[in-house]
């Protein structure tokens, strides 16, 4: 059994979440990868995904989310820029492997965004907003969304849970639909 763990990031509005998801490059280098949010009482919702097949070092931007897949390092870099309080929640990286079930990569990210800035005077807290220059509208990616055929009645665990897993990836639910997913606006 594998412990499904969380890592917490506490950030202020306007700041950037920057995480890297480690995957087995021989198995998954060209597989499509996605960034999902897990809301209480719901199945994971895909917010952004790489192309299929995933392109090496090619940034994919969906709203304020930027994905970069580095095949030679076996890393998916995820950035969420100009964070808002409503972005707070539980997130995860997954790898799509049709027709197999998708795999989740460790760890889940518990993002807590609060108002105001924590910086000392003179620190450039808002630098990421200037660097990335996010356009007001971007193309919303078409990503698979994997949902359970059963109605969800209970939220995913907020702490750790035992799940059976091959290697370091966790089996998610069965594939039932592919839909266009709303993203951050």
């Amino acid at each position: 059994a594998t412990k499904l763990t969380e890592e917490k990031y506490e950030l202020k509005e306007g700041q950037t979440l920057d995480v890297k998801c480690d995957y087995t490059l021989e198995k998954f280098a060209s597989s499509q990868k996605a960034w999902q949010i897990i809301r209480d009482g719901e199945m994971p919702k895909t917010l952004a995904c790489t192309e299929r097949p995933s392109k090496n070092s090619h940034p994919v931007q969906v709203g304020r989310i930027i994905l970069e897949d580095y095949h030679d390092h076996g890393l998916l870099r995820v950035r969420m820029v100009n964070l808002q309080v409503e972005d707070s929640g539980l997130y995860q990286c997954v790898i799509y492997q049709p027709p197999k079930e998708p795999h989740m990569l460790f760890d889940r990210i518990r993002l807590v965004v609060t108002k105001g800035f924590s910086g000392t005077p003179g620190s450039n807290e808002n630098s990421t907003q200037n660097v990335y220059k996010i356009p007001p509208t971007t193309t919303k990616a078409l990503c698979p969304l994997y949902t359970s055929p059963r109605t969800v009645t209970q939220a995913p665990p907020k702490s750790t849970a035992d799940v059976s897993t091959p290697d370091s990836e966790i089996n998610l639910t069965n594939v039932t639909d592919i839909i266009r997913v709303p993203v951050f606006n």
Epitope: T5, E10, Q15, D18, V19, D22, Y23, T165
Partner: antibody, heavy 119, light 108 residues
Framework: EVQVLESGGGLVQPGGSLRLSCAAS????????MSWVRQAPGKGLEWVST????????YYADSVKGRFTISRDNSKNTLDLQMNSLRAADTAVYYC????????????WGQGTLVTVSS | EIVMTQSPATLSVSPGERATLSCRAS??????LAWYQQKPGQAPRLLIY???TRATGIPDRFSGSGSGTEFTLTISSLQSEDFAVYYC??????????FGQGTKVEIK
């Protein structure tokens, strides 16, 4: 509880070899990258090497590249560092460290093992 | 290679006082910074990651701030167990992942 414990340190002559080992427990070992970080006597911390959770990706500091080899056995929850062509400058306490699941920082450290390279 | 510079090298503070440690990166690392505490004869311990987030079990008297190239670790009211050496480390993307040279916080 996450635990990492190093072993294998000792005294070795310049040009010699040594193999360090690290036994890990309390977490899903194959899900996390692992690293070696060293600290020369009275000095600061220096990152040495990192290996991904699956073992498919390895990274080395320029100072050890071509001389040190990092490896892991996920069936035994162990991490190794094979050190060849050792130099006096390699004298340090070597720490085994678990890499966080979301970024390349070190969330759990072993107590370290001392490697002394001297004739 | 990103160079991390900490200041001051030594900070003399009385128990109960506030301590402010600085760390500067040679190029922007956004918030990809961690702080560690190391006591004599012991392994380092993670205090802060992502520039602001306290690691599990770290008291709230420790706080991190800054982004880009300038970072600060603040200890609001120094306790006897806080006297140690503190290191910052960047983890923006690729190796080498570098540490600052350390700041020693000693009793005044």
């Amino acid at each position: 509880e996450v635990q990492v414990l190093e072993s294998g340190g000792g005294l070795v002559q310049p040009g010699g070899s040594l193999r360090l080992s690290c036994a890990a427990s309390g977490f899903t070992f194959n899900a996390y990258a692992m690293s070696w970080v060293r600290q020369a006597p009275g000095k600061g911390l220096e990152w040495v090497s990192t290996i991904s959770g699956s073992g498919s990706t390895t990274y080395y500091a320029d100072s050890v590249k071509g001389r040190f080899t990092i490896s892991r056995d996920n069936s035994k929850n162990t991490l190794d560092l094979q050190m060849n062509s050792l130099r006096a400058a390699d004298t340090a306490v070597y720490y085994c460290a678990k890499v966080a699941g979301s970024n390349f920082f070190f969330d759990h450290w072993g107590q370290g093992t001392l490697v002394t390279v001297s004739s | 290679e990103i160079v991390m510079t900490q200041s001051p090298a030594t900070l003399s503070v009385s128990p109960g006082e506030r301590a402010t440690l600085s760390c500067r990166a040679s190029q922007s690392i956004n918030a990809n910074l961690a702080w560690y505490q190391q006591k004599p004869g012991q392994a380092p311990r993670l205090l802060i990651y992502g520039a602001y987030t306290r690691a599990t079990g770290i008291p709230d008297r420790f706080s991190g701030s800054g982004s880009g190239t300038e970072f600060t670790l603040t200890i609001s009211s120094l306790q006897s167990e806080d006297f140690a050496v503190y290191y910052c480390q960047e983890f923006i993307m690729w190796p080498p992942w570098t540490f600052g040279q350390g700041t020693k916080v000693e009793i005044k």
